[in-house]
Interface confidence: low
């Protein structure tokens, strides 16, 4: 007796995947079915790859579900001005088949940028500076050539925005230098985007402070005492006179009498702490100490130097 042995399996790879039409966010594809391996093809899935993706990724299509008798579909939700290639995968009740060979590579068309820079912030810098920073927009979200940033800022509470155009996709920092910038003053800041197609949106407005002025007055009433052969305690008072420049902490400098001051060691305190302990010193040694206030702009003038000798070991 004769018998036919039919071996059913997942479909073979579809063939001739073609990009028929491409816009800024869509691509219309067509393909030919491969062998169904004796089990009807029930659906197709489309995958895409770009220079920015990790391997092949499934993409959204219209129709959302592509049945086995449909050989065209529109891929939606693509990023403008990105080079894409596509492939299709067929499936039947037995399983998912091998993917087709990739289509040709095609770039989507340009569009206005839509993604704003992340983490707009700033601060610091030198006197009379407003430093503004942000995270650059990834290339795949720039939506076109000629990408750049528009930095807008104004003193907090003022009406008029000052604008600066940075025609570089890599820009992530802008420094406004002007003698009228008062130390540690609040500014409203936002960063917008543009490309050859035009201007996109601005980031949400955030408040950034201009650069501080370093403390202008020295700490007062410096006093030091030996606690042991290895430890000294230093005390001081915040500046007596009105000090310009916020004080973030104090820097205590100490050096042995036989050493040069430029070889001094430094320790920093944080906040309004006005004493500190210096440890790991040598016994019966004369030390010189001085204290300065500091903030993000730098250190202020030094206090008078005081002397203290550690106890005998």
């Amino acid at each position: 007796a004769a018998a036919d042995l039919i071996v059913r399996g997942p479909p073979g790879p579809p063939e001739a995947v073609t990009i028929d039409e491409i816009t800024d966010t869509t691509a219309q594809l067509s393909w030919r079915p491969g062998p169904d391996n004796h089990s009807p093809i029930t659906m197709y899935v489309i995958q895409a790859r770009t220079p920015f993706s990790v391997g092949w990724q499934a993409v959204s299509t219209v129709p959302e579900l592509i049945d086995g008798k449909t050989f065209t579909a529109t891929v939606v939700g693509l990023n403008p001005w990105v080079e894409y290639e596509f492939r299709t995968v067929a499936a039947n009740v037995i399983g998912i088949g091998e993917p087709s060979r990739p289509s040709e590579k095609r770039r989507t068309e340009e569009a206005l940028p839509e993604v704003t820079p992340a983490n707009v912030s700033g601060g610091g810098g030198s006197k009379s500076e407003l430093v503004i920073t942000w995270e650059t927009v990834p290339e795949e979200l720039q939506n076109g050539r000629g990408f750049g940033y528009v930095v807008a800022f104004r003193p907090y509470g003022k009406m008029i925005w000052m604008l600066t155009v940075l025609a570089s996709a890599d820009a992530s920092r802008y420094v406004f230098r002007n003698e009228s910038v008062h130390p540690f003053s609040p500014f409203e800041v936002k960063v917008g985007v543009f490309n050859n197609k035009g201007e996109g949106p601005f980031s949400p407005t955030t408040v950034v402070y201009s650069a501080e002025e370093e403390p202008t007055k020295p700490p007062a009433s410096i006093f030091a005492r030996s606690l042991s052969a290895t430890d000294i305690e230093v005390f001081w008072a915040s500046p007596l006179e009105k000090n310009r420049g916020r004080i973030q902490g104090y820097e205590v400098k100490y050096w042995r009498h036989e050493d040069k001051e430029e070889n001094a060691r430094k320790i920093r305190t944080v906040g309004n702490q006005t004493s500190t302990k210096i440890t790991n010193l040598k016994g019966s040694v004369l030390y010189h100490l001085a204290v300065k206030a500091y903030n993000s702009a730098g250190t202020g003038p030094s206090s008078a130097t005081v002397n203290v000798t550690t106890r005998k070991p």
Partner: antibody
């Protein structure tokens, strides 16, 4: 002593343009914001425009926004107000004023005034 | 806009207080003796008095209110007094307070 001298305003025609210049002396001009303030006949003081010491920042009152331009020449110690598309309600005395601090947050910081110049907008 | 009384009166030698409200920043106080004459700055930034201004003029600011105080008012103090400040959107002056010395 600080002195601020405004140029003559005079009679202007509606729809025309006004240019006022203020010459400053007696202080480090580039370090201070400058203002133009005006007073209509029988009315109170009205803030018009402000410019920062370096000239990079300008602010305008709503009544003149889009019509006014304030600028400065730190080399010549002058500040200029250009007011276009003049209206009858622009009539008044225009004062040049100096901010009290190197970074001014509003008219509250004026510490010196010019003598004022009269502007009449009439056909 | 900034709000200040339209008029106040005082006898010679009395203390006068003129208030101003509506500023989100500091206040300044300006004296104008006749319309069209240049204003004179009495107080800037709430409390600072220019060196050529008599000490009988003083200023204070608390919250959203600024106050100009004239201690021992004189006949020559008769004038219109303007406050200046920032109303949250623009720099503004009050409508002015006329001081009459009796």
């Amino acid at each position: 002593a600080v002195t601020l001298d405004e140029s003559e305003g005079g009679l202007q025609t509606p729809g025309g343009a006004l240019s006022l210049v203020c010459k400053a002396s007696g202080f480090t001009f580039s370090s201070f914001n400058m203002f133009w303030v005006r007073q209509a006949p029988g009315k109170g003081l009205e803030y018009v425009a402000e410019i920062s010491g370096g000239g990079g920042s300008t602010w305008y009152a709503p009544a003149v926004k889009g019509r006014a331009t304030i600028s400065r020449d730190n080399g010549q110690s002058t500040v200029r107000l250009q007011l276009n598309n003049l209206r009858a309600e622009d009539t008044g005395t225009y004062y040049c004023a100096k901010s009290a601090d190197t970074w001014s947050y509003g008219a509250a910081t004026i510490d010196a005034w010019g003598h004022g110049t009269e502007v009449i907008v009439s056909s | 806009a900034l709000t200040q009384p339209s008029s106040v009166s005082a006898n010679l030698g009395e203390t006068v207080k003129i208030t101003c409200s509506g500023s989100s920043g500091s206040y300044g106080w300006y004296q104008q003796k006749s319309p069209g004459s240049a204003p004179v700055t009495l107080i800037y930034d709430n409390t600072n008095r220019p060196s050529d201004i008599p000490s009988r003029f003083s200023g204070s600011g608390s919250g959203s209110t600024g106050t100009l105080t004239i201690t021992g008012v004189r006949a020559e103090d008769e004038a219109v007094y303007y406050c200046g400040g920032y109303d949250g959107s623009t720099d503004v002056f009050g409508a002015g307070t006329t001081l009459t010395v009796l």
